[in-house]
């Protein structure tokens, strides 16, 4: 297993609709054709898996049904979008990239993007 640098923004604020987007960029040492991207969430000393997708270079990322993630790829960049976030989902979201094929296998883990989610205030009752 060889190490690889992965860069991602330090902080992102989710929209009022609970959507957060960030770019995960990896320094590919070779010509990988198959790449696996996994998003991990670290909060309260627990690390959980948010979503994962394997894609062939030049093709779209395909996440599993009912995943809260969507994404596109362009060269060595992956544009990730996480939907349906609530305040309780605030945490450090870490981008993990694996170059699966051809060998050798490379693994890179970013420092994480702190995503802040603020639940929208309920609309005040109107008397109309």
């Amino acid at each position: 297993c060889k190490a690889m640098h992965v860069a991602q923004p330090a902080v992102v604020l989710a929209s009022s609709r609970g959507i957060a987007s960030f770019v995960c960029e990896y320094a590919s040492p070779g010509k990988a054709t198959e790449v696996r991207v996994t998003v991990l969430r670290q909060a309260d000393s627990q690390v959980t898996e948010v979503c994962a997708a394997t894609y062939m270079m030049g093709n779209e990322l395909t996440f599993l049904d009912d995943s809260i993630c969507t994404g596109t790829s362009s060269g060595n960049q992956v544009n990730l979008t996480i939907q349906g976030l609530r305040a309780m989902d605030t945490g450090l979201y870490i981008c993990k990239v694996e170059l699966m094929y051809p060998p050798p296998y490379y693994l890179g883990i970013g420092n994480g993007t702190q995503i802040y989610v603020i639940d929208p205030e309920p609309c005040p009752d109107s008397d109309f």
Partner: antibody, heavy 123, light 106 residues
């Protein structure tokens, strides 16, 4: 159809490592998580840990230092290893299919379970 | 860790009765599952995502709730419903189960 089957020794000596295998069929380990749950005789259910579709693991904090879960996707197998066992680890151990990731739009359930295997820790 | 308190811990009822089992969490959760377990058997999924009926489960079972309080209701008990029932939360790890409710025939 979806099936999970636990296998491993039924008797383990104290201080040794408990090793179990969950062999699955009818679904892919890259599309679902596999969750481990145990049940001491006459008691309730305790969640041990999970290996998600992407291969990441998460463990019950009470067992984290002793527990390892891994998978071999090509063999459709998930393994559980629990080290330094004591009599308190005597239980029926279940593997179950569950959501592929910790955060989903829907589908939060362990929908299929193995039949369970009784592991007794005794000298 | 989120603790799940199930009540009652045991319950005697008759065929045809309406039965409600409650589960209370120590902090607000998002999704709840309910399982049925018979002696010597693995748990069986009844309800997922708080209120959705699992495949093949009779419609007399229903789930509801939000925040910290959730319920499983059996509208008209059948002989095959006498078993132990467990709730389980999906909001944070470690996942936790309630202590179980043993439903016995009166």
């Amino acid at each position: 159809q979806v099936q999970l089957q636990e296998s491993g020794p039924g008797l383990v000596k104290p201080s040794q490592t408990l090793s179990l295998t969950c062999t699955v069929s009818g679904f892919s380990l890259t599309s679902y998580g596999v969750y481990w749950v145990r049940q001491p005789p006459g008691k309730g259910l305790e969640w041990l840990g999970v290996i998600w579709a992407g291969g990441t693991t998460n463990y019950n904090s009470a067992l984290m230092s002793r527990l390892t879960i891994s998978k071999d996707t090509s063999k459709n197998q998930v393994s559980l290893k629990l080290s330094s066992v004591t009599a308190a680890d005597t239980a029926v151990y279940y593997c179950a299919r569950g959501p592929p990731h910790a955060m989903m739009k829907r589908g939060y359930a362990m929908d299929y379970w193995g039949q369970g295997t009784l592991v007794t820790v005794s000298s | 860790d989120i603790q799940m308190t199930q009540s009652p811990s045991s319950l005697s009822a008759s065929v045809g009765d309406r039965v409600t089992i409650t589960c209370s969490a120590t902090s607000s959760i998002t999704y709840m599952s309910w399982y049925q377990q018979k002696p010597g058997k693995a748990p069986k999924l009844l309800i997922y995502d708080t209120s959705n009926l699992a495949s093949g489960v009779p419609s007399r079972f229903s789930g509801s709730g939000s925040g910290t309080d959730y319920t499983l209701t059996i509208s008209s008990l059948q002989p095959e419903d006498f078993a132990t029932y467990y709730c389980q939360q999906w909001s944070s790890y470690p996942l936790t189960f309630g202590g179980g409710t043993k439903l016995e025939i009166k």
